[in-house]
Amino acid sequence: EEELQVIQPDKSVSVAAGESAILHCTVTSLIPVGPIQWFRGAGPARELIYNQKEGHFPRVTTVSESTKRENMDFSISISNITPADAGTYYCVKFRKGSPDTEFKSGAGTELSVRAKPS
């Protein structure tokens, strides 16, 4: 059988400053067990953008309903985009453990920020 895939369908997204950016991510299986997290950038210096369980991410909302059963849509919306938000965003599946370990990453979505229309 095929193992879980993390699908980020958009290679790039362009958003005007002040608008919201939707970053799409779906997975193809509910297993292995473990959370999805979003990061900007790759490697050890990557920045955590959203972790559903812990942390405070006031500009981030999840696209799927919080009560949706068997959810495989882990898309997020980031509000009030500024030029500082530009970068490549990765949707990452973790395998549950102590600690959780990275299982598979999406290919990334590059967010570019256009000037706010005058």
């Epitope: 509910l30 297993i31 292995p32 067990v33 473990g34 959810n71 549950k96």
Partner: antibody, heavy 120, light 108 residues
Framework: EVQLVESGGGVVQPGGSLRLSCAAS????????MSWVRQAPGKGLEWVST??????YYADSVKGRFTISRDNSKNTLYLQMNSLRAEDTAVYYC???????????????WGQGTLVTVSS | EIVLTQSPATLSVSPGERVTFSCRAS??????IAWYQQKPGQAPRLLIY???SRDTGIPDRFSGSGSGTDFTLTISSLQSEDFGVYYC??????????FGGGTKVEIK
Amino acid sequence: EVQLVESGGGVVQPGGSLRLSCAASGFSFSIYAMSWVRQAPGKGLEWVSTIGADDTYYADSVKGRFTISRDNSKNTLYLQMNSLRAEDTAVYYCAKDSTVGWSGDFFDYWGQGTLVTVSS
Amino acid sequence: EIVLTQSPATLSVSPGERVTFSCRASQNVRSDIAWYQQKPGQAPRLLIYAASSRDTGIPDRFSGSGSGTDFTLTISSLQSEDFGVYYCQQYYDWPPFTFGGGTKVEIK
């Protein structure tokens, strides 16, 4: 219709072994986590083990003695129980895991259970 | 390990009465609580998940509420088929998944 049917229970002596099976139908077995939950006679529910893909999780009380596995080609969940003790006597339920939103897991379908009795 | 404490252990109720069950967690579990009903000789049945969402086919006389550490299951008007034992379960932090000790509902 989701169906979970356990088998393999019985009477075994302390230190013995049993293998429980759970035949699943009515859903895409291979993409769901599956669990075993037990209930000692007259007692409450106790989680035993969960399996995702090849990721497995155990209660401390059974760690090192029980092994959970699955055969997706047969839509079957297993629990290999070794070094059985009197306190393992219980009805063992197979359960399908469910998730909600970005969170999980709880158990939305249960089998009818199979009784394991450990006694000399 | 998160400990769930259910109270009372037993409730004696007459059909038609409103029934409230309590489940208290030893630490914050957000809304990651499920409720199950178990009748004698039967497997548990999922009633409520995410603290307040009814499972498919569950009558609307069953409702759940709460978040953090204190949760409630309410049956607005108890029917004869509602007698049994009710368990809460947390899935916020596992392993292990933990269940409350149960509340038995018996006929007064």
